[in-house]
Interface confidence: low
Amino acid sequence: APRGTQAEESPFVGNPGNITGARGLTGTLRCQLQVQGEPPEVHWLRDGQILELADSTQTQVPLGEDEQDDWIVVSQLRITSLQLSDTGQYQCLVFLGHQTFVSQPGYVGLEGLPYFLEEPEDRTVAANTPFNLSCQAQGPPEPVDLLWLQDAVPLATAPGHGPQRSLHVPGLNKTSSFSCEAHNAKGVTTSRTATITVLPQQPRNLHLVSRQPTELEVAWTPGLSGIYPLTHCTLQAVLSDDGMGIQAGEPDPPEEPLTSQASVPPHQLRLGSLHPHTPYHIRVACTSSQGPSSWTHWLPVETPEGVPLGPPENISATRNGSQAFVHWQEPRAPLQGTLLGYRLAYQGQDTPEVLMDIGLRQEVTLELQGDGSVSNLTVCVAAYTAAGDGPWSLPVPLEAWRPGQAQPVHQLVKEPSTPAFSWPWW
């Protein structure tokens, strides 16, 4: 019978050897068999599973001139960069006729310096704030014991005696480096060195100190910054746009913020050029030589109303006997709030000043006291908001009414001859 066709007679004359080495090693496993007739294809098994994508080469050498003579077949499996997944039991497998033959096993083992699965990463942390770092290594050989180092100083008395996969750091006051050493029977591997940059803590207690229609004075409490003094703090203000929805944790304002820098101390800043009677959101961050803190949450604030910045415009005052008709237009200057109305004052040369609240109307007919013979009568008008009166207009003299001049009908306003309070005459 041809060689290799009997169940008890294995065609294999050379079985895979053993390879044990460190990660990255390149090695070759070899199988040799002698068969009669056409050489079969040699398959490789790892732990009983056929390797579909094996990096193998097969060499066939005839031992005679006839095809039916014996052949020597050599299959070589190349392991290019040894990894944990390559380890296991390797065998060659051939199909001869209706029979399957498997070689004796060879073994591939991994043994070397520890290999890091996870290494500490660079990060920024706020001063005196706890955080964790991770490090994970494996053999073989096991066990692998870790030793953490801070600024190159071991944090435990011996490998395996300190924190292992996770290092809890209660807080730092200076930028520090951390690494971990992995120890096993073959030696020591050192991880990458992670730089932990210590930034200032987030400022606290951002609050308003004082409010003006166009400026806000704010203050805050600085957070700890470790050994690094704060160089400055940055304050941002953004228009709230009627509850435009800056939530406490929303990362960015919806529009370009107004940004101001404050040298510190003091931890206080006057924000100017704001709109009166307007809601804003503000936040602050402080910076050291190591970088900026995180921003505080957005704080809603509002500038107060101001008084109108200018007097009413285009005031005209005409007189017809004992009646005077006065009308005006809204100030062109900013109102700095909600216009609540107008005040009007009139006075003759030798008579006391009369002060009236006109409300939101922009015209009034005055019933003058006496026979209308008061001379040199002048009128002033001021607009007012909840914050108070704006500037009074310059005195406008009452002009005599000339026939042909329009005289609209107005509600007559009778005022007492003595004012309830005196108003400064501008």
Epitope: P130, E142, P143, V144, D145, T157, A158, P159, G160, H161, G162, P163, Q164, R165, H168, P170, G171
Partner: antibody, heavy 115, light 107 residues
Framework: EVQLVQSGAEVKKPGASVKVSCKAS????????MHWVRQAPGQGLEWMGI????????SYAQKFQGRVTMTRDTSTSTVYMELSSLRSEDSAVYYC????????WGAGTTVTVSA | NIQMTQSPSSVSASVGDRVTITCRAS??????LAWYQQKPGKAPKLLIY???SLQSGVPSRFSGSGSGTDFTLTISSLQPEDFATYYC?????????FGGGTKVEIK
Amino acid sequence: EVQLVQSGAEVKKPGASVKVSCKASGYTFTSYYMHWVRQAPGQGLEWMGIINPSGGSTSYAQKFQGRVTMTRDTSTSTVYMELSSLRSEDSAVYYCARDWYFDVWGAGTTVTVSA
Amino acid sequence: NIQMTQSPSSVSASVGDRVTITCRASQGISSWLAWYQQKPGKAPKLLIYAASSLQSGVPSRFSGSGSGTDFTLTISSLQPEDFATYYCQQANSFPFTFGGGTKVEIK
């Protein structure tokens, strides 16, 4: 639920040995240290030593050096503390406790040493 | 070995009181300090680790502070279930050592 279940109370004669077990469940056994702490009646807490269940490495308090052995069996997630040459002053409750800071404790094992 | 000295050894207080316990290390231990609560017949319970970090599930009336050699445990408003013995413990270097304990009793 993370649990440390300790073996039952023991009564021993002076000079004998005692082996207390602590079986962990509800977490990855090899990822956390285990400590042994004891407390004599009416006294404070006393740290005895630590074992790293991953590698099996140990460190013992000087006071117990030579008398204490801490071991672990990863297949059953159990650590053991054996104290030999027992004397009456070793009568105490023995606790196992997990992690660098002792975040989970066993219920304790009472060991009484009496002639 | 690092010695841990706790004071006072006992304190009498009423429900609602603010209680402060101090712990001093014989040498600097950075923030490697824990506080435990123990009730009679029970295992200790971790309250504070890393000097000031509150263990999960522990009420916020417990707080820790300090660094280096001097540490404080504060109970802001004592509750009936807080009457117990409290221990500090350093985790800076072997052997780990405990303070002698402070018993908080009902006044």
